[in-house]
Interface confidence: low
């Protein structure tokens, strides 16, 4: 049978390297040779390119090389397939070389801020060495912040006579490191170069862009004054590298703005001792370039009743995240403050906090929390300047098996009964929420038995034992990740009882 007609011919001119044409060969049953016929020099000349490979995938491509390729030019390309039964020709295809030229990528050599111009970086590059002198180049510049994965793109063109191979990328975040890549194409071409090597650059620093402010209210002291720990951090979306020289704080009783106190600090928290009434606290951060907008927080009076609206709350782990969800009875509350800290016996030193808006759930990457640590998580509803009653739960980002089993004792040994008691495992050793305990017991040389009880039970009575028999018993504490046995204890049931 005649060979299949070659279809889907496509040609690319790798500028100053070669012109490569490819096609779909069709299902060939016998050996087929392909010849690509070209006319060039605006139809004045013609030549052939013959595939000489025996592997079918390499036979669907053929290349013409320099010096017989120059831009601009018009080509016709036709592919002939030949086997023992005859020859079949493709359709004639027509190509303008400048429409199919593909260059090397440009080389970015410098990405820098322009001194004194905010939120901008200037990209300087070298045009590809092999690019048509007679054509303008078009460019796509793609950029992203260092810690982002999604690219933004901007397109522009450069005149071939333009010596200045620079582009000013504006509208960026201040004091932020960007990753830049550039590609180019002959203006008339549909083929883009590959992307250049990526280069980093940073925008200039600006005044801080803002703060988030929070507080921890402590019980009133004997003199009626109340310690309030103020906490603050850069506003969400602030440049990662944003530096602050210091903070300026001022506060006053809600009833009397004339009693304003001010202070400066370079720390990220501050302990205030306030009277029992309600207060307003305001603060700004500053650097050598200016001040941030003011952040303000209301501190309620000691006796002020806070509203309650969270009805139920639960935590679960899903896809490497700890997810906390809650239900609220107040539809007008749409901002919440989340506090979390490790549940350790000492005073919490590492309180973390974050606000959530327009949602009744909060997620945190598992790796931002220590595995096998219990965290206290509180959610505060916030309505305008009022902060509601928190709802608190405990959760683990990742559970493990307890690092030790329960400390076990045997009490009330009888003829056929015994009471097994055990202590709760210390918090630091639990590695997860204890969901149950399992009591394993076995008579010497006999069959083993087990009984599982829920985690609120710390003792269990074994019955129907054999009299005057040695038993071994141990208690296992389990989390969702598995269980750990306590030490095994031996006891012997009595031979008779005074009650028999």
């Amino acid at each position: 049978a005649l060979p299949a007609k070659p279809e889907n011919i496509s040609c690319v001119y790798y500028y100053r390297k070669n012109l490569t044409c490819t096609w779909s060969p069709g299902k060939e049953t016998s050996y087929t040779q392909y010849t690509v016929k070209r006319t060039y020099a605006f139809g004045e000349k013609h030549d052939n390119c013959t595939t000489n490979s025996s592997t079918s995938e390499n036979r669907a491509s053929c290349s013409f090389f320099l010096p017989r390729i120059t831009i601009p030019d018009n080509y016709t390309i036709e592919v002939e397939a030949e086997n023992g039964d005859g020859v079949i020709k493709s359709h004639m295809t027509y190509w303008r070389l400048e429409n199919i030229a593909k260059t090397e990528p440009p080389k970015i050599f410098r990405v820098k801020p322009v001194l004194g111009i905010k939120r901008m970086i200037q990209i300087e590059w070298i045009k590809p060495e092999l690019a048509p002198v007679s054509s303008d180049l078009k460019y796509t510049l793609r950029f992203r912040t260092v810690n982002s994965t999604s690219w933004m793109e901007v397109n522009f063109a450069k005149n071939r006579k333009d010596k200045n191979q620079t582009y000013n990328l504006t509208g960026l975040q201040p004091f932020t490191e960007y990753v830049i890549a550039l590609r180019c194409a002959v203006k008339e071409s549909k083929f883009w170069s590959d992307w250049s090597q990526e280069k980093m650059g940073m925008t200039e620093e600006e005044a801080p862009c803002g703060l988030e402010l929070w507080r921890v209210l402590k019980p009133a002291e004997a003199d009626g004054r109340r310690p309030v720990r103020l906490l603050w951090k850069k506003a969400r979306g602030a440049p990662v590298l944003e530096k602050t020289l210091g903070y300026n704080i001022w506060y006053y009783p809600e009833s009397n703005t004339n009693l304003t106190e001010t202070m400066n600090t370079t720390n990220q928290q501050l302990e205030l001792h306030l009277g029992g009434e309600s207060f307003w606290v305001s603060m700004i951060s500053y650097n050598s370039l200016g001040k941030s907008p003011v952040a303000t927080l209301r501190i309620p009076a000691i006796q002020e009743k806070s509203f309650q609206c969270i009805e139920v709350m639960q935590a679960c782990v899903a896809e490497d995240q700890l997810v906390v969800k809650w239900q609220s009875s107040a539809l007008d509350v749409n901002t919440w403050m989340i506090e979390w800290f490790p549940d350790v016996d000492s005073e919490p030193t590492t309180l973390s906090w974050e606000s959530v808006s327009q949602a009744t759930n909060w997620t945190i990457q598992q790796d931002k929390l220590k595995p096998f640590w219990c965290y206290n998580i509180s959610v505060y509803p916030m309505l305008h300047d009022k902060v509601g009653e928190p709802y608190s739960i405990q959760a683990y980002a990742k559970e493990g098996v307890p690092s030790e089993g329960p400390e076990t004792k045997v009490e009330n040994i009888g003829v056929k009964t015994v009471t097994i008691t055990w202590k709760e495992i210390p918090k630091s050793e639990r590695k997860g929420i204890i969901c149950n305990y399992t009591i394993f017991y076995q008579a010497e040389g006999g069959k083993g038995f087990s009984k599982t009880v829920n985690s609120s039970i710390l003792q269990y009575g074994l019955e129907s034992l054999k009299r005057k028999t040695s038993y071994i018993v141990q208690v296992m504490a389990s989390t969702s990740a598995g269980g750990t046995n306590g030490t095994s204890i031996n006891f012997k049931t009595l031979s008779f009882s005074v009650f028999e």
Epitope: F109, R110, L115, G116
Partner: antibody, heavy 121, light 107 residues
Framework: QVQLVQSGAEVKKPGASVKVSCKAS????????MNWVRQAPGQGLEWMGL????????SYNQQFQDRVTITADKSTSTAYMELSSLRSEDTAVYYC??????????????WGQGTLVTVSS | DIQMTQSPSSLSASVGDRVTITCQAS??????LAWYQQKPGKAPKLLIY???TEAQGVPSRFSGSGSGTDFTLTISSLQPEDFATYYC?????????FGGGTKVEIK
């Protein structure tokens, strides 16, 4: 023609500061970046930092970041380099050098005659 | 920071000799390299920039070559006034760094 004329030699005690000036003429002062480079006796060249006199923007070598301040006075076409907390190893000739930006960015096209700063107790 | 390594640190040559000094960058600096000449008690003088472009008024016996990380300064026929110390410097970005210098002395 383009000229950079620096202030005279200085002798300073350890811990003191020195301020070297560099007066430019023969070109538009605000159109070119000014660099400062130093050379300890018998040693090589060490770039300290630069200033864009047009807007006062600076860039410093990390090694000097905390001790060097480069400024420019547009009205007198003069650049200044101040080095604080001087120590004996700061004994060197300090040069100002104009950037040849038209020909190649960061090439030091025109140099001052140098100012010898001696730090000695 | 980009490190610049120059070799040799010194060499002896006679008038009329062809002299070659090399400079290596610790990373790709394309063709952004300058060469300076410094005579005792004087400020350095720009000879070559962009690896091979001669600065204004520099005699044609001075030539530069190379790109990427390896560069060469060649003096085709050494003249009496060429005995000096030569420094390479990358002009790729700040911070600018110089090579350690090559002292060309009379043999």
């Amino acid at each position: 023609q383009v000229q950079l004329v620096q202030s005279g030699a200085e002798v300073k005690k350890p811990g003191a500061s020195v301020k070297v000036s560099c007066k430019a003429s023969g070109y538009t002062f605000t159109g070119y970046i000014m660099n400062w480079v130093r050379q300890a006796p018998g040693q090589g060249l060490e770039w300290m930092g630069l200033i864009n006199p047009y807007n006062g923007g600076t860039s410093y070598n990390q090694q000097f970041q905390d001790r060097v301040t480069i400024t420019a006075d547009k009205s007198t076409s003069t650049a200044y380099m101040e080095l604080s907390s001087l120590r004996s190893e700061d004994t060197a000739v300090y040069y100002c050098a104009r950037d040849g930006y038209d020909d190649g960015p960061y090439t030091l096209e025109t140099w001052g005659q140098g100012t010898l700063v001696t730090v000695s107790s | 920071d980009i490190q610049m390594t120059q070799s040799p640190s010194s060499l002896s040559a006679s008038v009329g000799d062809r002299v070659t000094i090399t400079c290596q960058a610790s990373e790709d600096i394309y063709s952004f390299l300058a060469w300076y000449q410094q005579k005792p008690g004087k400020a350095p003088k720009l000879l070559i920039y962009n690896a091979q472009t001669e600065a204004q008024g520099v005699p044609s016996r001075f030539s530069g070559s190379g790109s990427g990380t390896d560069f060469t300064l060649t003096i085709s026929s050494l003249q009496p006034e060429d005995f000096a110390t030569y420094y390479c410097q990358h002009h790729y970005d700040s911070p600018l760094t110089f090579g350690g210098g090559t002292k060309v002395e009379i043999k």
